[in-house]
């Protein structure tokens, strides 16, 4: 074990607590320990032990209360199906090892729903969905028997109920009792039986949480006035008169620890970002708690719907704030939420019944004071008139999500607090804070948001292309002339935006190689579309050897790109996507976007360059204020431009200028960076404002970027606001919603 056998801070010796085949770590300053086993193994007979007041560790007891002398890591098995109605499964076995498969078949007259084949996963859970053989005769469809559970009840008429049970030692998550409701839906949520060693994987949590959350926040056209059992997916219309309150409740007790607290804050920042990306502006309440709760943001505050401001408040919260009173009083924390929901003098304000409430609770588990928090959830349901009227139960108006983090989580407690809704999951148990952070990164990246422009996966495990998923590498092979390298940006599923000068009129489509997402394979090109006003030789007679005005081109791909974590579009100016990315009102005009992105001042921006096979972001300032003139004048130092009398002959209104030493020394672009995007990074989103075109000084001779460069080393980029009519015309079928 990694621990010395010295006595911990608590009062229990570590003598003999080792686990065969694994290690242990101390929790709660030595008052508890957790056994850790390699992947595919679990600690037997228990996962955690507590230090008793007698100075000894809690006994190693099996589920049937037999005492074991020494803990050991045992191979994880998946439970076997206790029952399978109206069909057969194969192979039959008392237990199943990781990667074992079973398949399900239905008797004649029955149809299979769910997964016909399921695989035992490394976390002890079966892949896929519960397999159900149903003949479609019942008023409700057969709710199924999730593997590991036992079901009592086989009648599915309106108002019939079924109940579920778990074997001894396993905890039931979800609904123990489900009732067949009007419209053919089952009340509650599908149950499952959890062993203490089972955790939800980040991917599972991200998918389940998001699919439930998007049901709550997506503004989807739906008829209002849902019947009690209306089985349609829970679609909620956020009509202008309705609204949404999201309450973030964060455990700051001793057992959480400072780094976990910071991690949880990161998760919530990502969540706020995610919700904002849907164009929804909920009001936020923000509570941290230990022995007492502390309200940081009230939903009634004017700025509570300003995602940036709420994020700022969240980032400023300090773990130390609860230092002196470090119990875990979840009940008090939920009472703080209740107080935010309730109205003065018990007089409901206009529209109270159109406000949807979402509580997101992150805790490491055990409330150890204040009493049972479930009573407060009941009070909240009462206040919001939920579940009282059979005709209009209003269940859609409250969602309680509980994230249990770490080994001490009491699954029964967190399950009791969480909402239970058909086909949704509101309770999650993750291994540690790192896993929870993964959840929220994955969540930001889920498939529904893949088409959102300018989103990146800023995660410690992310590759270069996770962080710059729009970046495209372009090379043009010219027989006997070597090859030209450029960059570009994915702007839609069929188009990459780059510089026109990367190509000549003689370049054939097959000689142009484009790769995205860091993939080795090249994409097939259909055509390269040049801006009609681009003509590099346009001013040769005037003694200007190369003229880069309108230096933009679009590469049309033969096949549609498949967006994923490493391939996704950058935002273009004057599109609906950018309006949403900047969280501007839907009525925002192109001019207003321009003022937001390119105000008349020095504008912080970035470009992406490849150095030693790695993509790196380079921070620069667009000189768009008082330094603009001097920046543009430095173009005269460019080779071939020394004879130019009026610099506006070469620096047309189409260009943005970066580089130089003021306000900061900007890094410069290299030849291979041409065609790449000049980007403004705002509100965690990336918007392309320019295309890298040409530079005054070649700072990258001999493949090395020079450290010392002259003050007149400037770079010029085509301003996309100046070529919008062309972009709009060529990208008209790409669903970008040009303003």
């Amino acid at each position: 074990t990694p621990w010395s056998l010295a006595r911990p801070q608590g009062s229990c010796s570590l003598e003999g607590v080792e686990i065969k085949g694994g290690s242990f770590r101390l929790l709660q300053e030595g008052q508890a320990l957790e056994y850790v086993c390699p992947s595919g193994f679990y600690p037997y007979p228990v996962q955690t032990r507590t230090c008793r007041s007698t100075g000894s560790w809690s006994t190693l007891k099996t589920q049937d209360q037999k005492t074991v002398r020494k803990a050991e890591c045992r191979a994880i098995h998946c439970p076997r199906p206790h029952d399978f109605e109206n069909g057969e499964y194969w192979p039959r076995s008392p237990y199943y090892n990781v990667s074992d498969e079973i398949s399900f078949h239905c008797y004649d007259g029955y149809t299979l729903r769910g997964s016909a084949n399921r695989t035992c996963q490394v976390n002890g859970r079966w892949s896929g969905q519960t397999a159900i053989c149903d003949n479609g005769a019942g008023y409700c469809s057969n709710p199924g028997i999730p593997i590991g559970t036992r079901k009592v009840g086989s009648q599915y008429r309106l108002e019939d109920s079924v109940t579920y049970h778990c074997s001894r030692g396993l905890t039931l998550r979800g609904s123990q009792r489900r009732t067949c409701q009007e419209g053919g839906s089952w009340s509650g949520t599908e149950p499952s039986c959890q062993d203490s060693f089972m955790y939800d994987t980040p991917q599972e949590v991200a998918e389940a949480f998001l699919s439930s959350l998007t049901e709550t926040i997506e503004g989807v056209d739906a008829e209002d006035g849902h019947g009690p059992g209306e089985q349609q997916k829970r679609k909620i219309v956020l009509d202008p008169s309705g609204s949404m309150n999201i309450y973030l409740v964060l455990d700051g007790s001793d057992s959480i620890g400072a780094s976990n607290f910071t991690g949880a804050k990161k998760c919530l920042v990502n969540l706020i970002e995610k919700v904002a990306s849907y164009g929804v502006k909920p009001r936020y309440g923000l509570v941290t708690y230990a022995t007492y709760p502390k309200i940081w943001v009230k939903v009634s505050e004017a700025d509570s719907s300003n995602a940036d401001w709420v994020t700022k408040q969240l980032n400023e919260i300090n773990y130390e704030d609860h230092k002196l009173k470090s119990g875990t009083n979840t009940k008090k924390a939920l009472q703080a939420v209740y107080s935010m929901m309730s109205w003065p003098d018990d007089v409901p304000p206009e529209g109270w019944n159109r406000t949807r409430h979402v509580i997101i609770l992150m805790t490491d588990g055990l409330h150890n004071m204040g009493g049972d928090p479930i009573t407060v959830i009941d009070e909240i349901r009462d206040l919001l008139y939920i579940g009282k009227d059979r005709k209009n139960p209003r269940e859609d108006y409250l969602d309680v999500y509980v994230f249990g983090v770490g080994p001490l989580v009491n699954q029964v407690n967190i399950n009791a607090l969480a909402s239970k809704k058909d086909n949704e999951q509101h309770v999650f148990k993750v291994k540690d804070m790192e896993n929870l952070e993964d959840v929220f990164y994955q969540m930001i990246d889920e498939s529904q948001s893949l088409s959102l422009c300018g989103m990146v996966w800023e995660h410690r495990k992310g590759t270069d292309y996770h962080k710059q998923p729009w970046q495209a590498k372009i090379s043009v092979i010219r027989p006997s002339k070597g090859h030209e390298s450029c960059m570009g940006a994915v702007v839609s599923e069929y188009f990459v935006l780059t510089a026109a000068h990367c190509f000549t009129v003689d370049d054939k489509e097959h000689s142009i190689k484009v790769s995205v997402g860091g993939e080795k394979r090249d994409l097939e090109i259909e055509v390269v579309l040049f801006h009609p006003n681009y003509n590099i030789n346009g001013k040769k007679e005037a003694g200007i050897p190369e003229f880069y005005d309108y230096d933009v081109a679009l590469i049309k791909l033969k096949n549609k790109l498949k967006y994923g974590q490493t391939i996704r579009p950058i935002c273009l100016p004057c599109t609906e996507g950018t309006t949403r990315a900047l969280r501007l009102p839907p009525t925002t005009t192109c001019q207003q976007q321009k003022e937001e992105l390119l105000p008349a001042q020095d504008i912080k921006a970035l470009f992406v360059s490849e150095e030693e096979k790695k993509l790196t972001r380079k921070e620069v300032y667009i000189k768009n204020g008082d330094k603009k003139g001097s920046c543009e004048r430095d173009a005269q130092y460019a080779p071939g431009y020394d004879k130019v009398k009026d610099i506006s002959e070469v620096v047309t209104p189409r260009f943005l200028c970066t580089g130089g030493v003021s306000p900061y020394a900007d890094p410069n672009t290299c030849r291979g960076d041409s065609g790449g995007p000049l980007i403004v990074h705002k509100r965690s989103r990336f918007i392309q404002v320019g295309v890298i075109s040409w530079g005054v000084v070649d700072v990258c001779k001999n493949q090395k970027r020079q450290k010392q460069v002259p003050a007149h080393a400037r770079d010029f980029h085509i301003n996309l606001f100046q070529v919008l009519p062309w972009l709009k015309e060529k990208l008209q079928d790409e669903d970008l919603g040009f303003l």
Partner: antibody
């Protein structure tokens, strides 16, 4: 085969009560909900409610709440529907109907009907 | 309550011809997860109790001739008799069981032309 035999026609005064019986045979009485539907002369059909003969649990249409009582006697496989505080617009043929084992919503078997006339 | 509206109120069709009765509900009867429509059709001949013809909007009850068929989804449903027979003269009712109270259409009287 499944049979539902209802009691005979009744004539009642306004304000009185009527109790219609429905005797089931040819199947296990407690396994199937019994539903009551009425039809005023020359009018359409109107669902009144059901009883689960197994548990005795009932579900009534809001319209009849407080006036209707559905009961059963499992020993003689008979379901009853009592309607109180009768009004002239309660004049109708009252049917008992049985659904399927799996789904009580589809009325596959019907009694012959009982005409209840409410008249002063 | 869900209101069921049938059209036409009455219909005269020649023997051997197709008869079509429509039924419209005031809200959707479709369960989108199971793709089932909670609607049934009944036939009632004079002096008799109703008879179940179709359930789940399109599933024919056993023993019902195959000239009877049901179609539609959501809020609009149709009962079709492909070739009218003399014994099909009756009143036809649609019924929703999506929400309580279960409600019937006002009925469509089918006669021979």
């Amino acid at each position: 085969q499944v049979q539902l035999v209802q009691s005979g026609a009744e004539v009642k005064k306004p304000g009185a009560s009527v109790k219609v019986s429905c005797k089931a045979s040819g199947y296990s009485f407690t396994d199937y909900y019994m539903t009551w539907v009425r039809q005023a002369p020359g009018q359409g059909l109107e669902w009144m409610g059901w009883i689960n003969p197994n548990s005795g649990g009932t579900k009534y249409a809001q319209k009849f709440q407080g006036r209707v009582t559905m009961t059963r006697d499992t020993s003689i496989s008979t379901a009853y529907m009592e309607l109180s505080r009768l009004r002239s617009d309660d004049t109708a043929v009252y049917y008992c109907a049985r659904g399927y084992y799996a789904n009580s919503a589809w009325f596959a078997y019907w009694g012959q009907g009982t005409l209840v006339t409410v008249s002063s | 309550d869900i209101v069921m509206t049938q059209s036409p109120d009455s219909l005269a069709v020649s023997l051997g011809e197709r008869a079509t009765i429509n039924c419209k509900s005031s809200q959707s009867l479709l369960n989108s997860r199971t793709s089932k429509n909670y609607l049934a059709w009944y036939q009632q001949k004079p002096g008799q109790p109703p008879k179940l013809l179709i359930y789940w909007a399109s599933t024919r009850e056993s023993g019902v001739p195959d000239r009877f068929s049901g179609s539609g989804s959501g809020t609009d449903f149709t009962l079709t008799i492909s070739s009218l027979q003399a014994e099909d003269v009756a009143v036809y009712y649609c019924k929703q069981v999506y929400n309580l109270p279960w409600t019937f259409g006002q009925g469509t009287k089918l006669e021979i032309k």
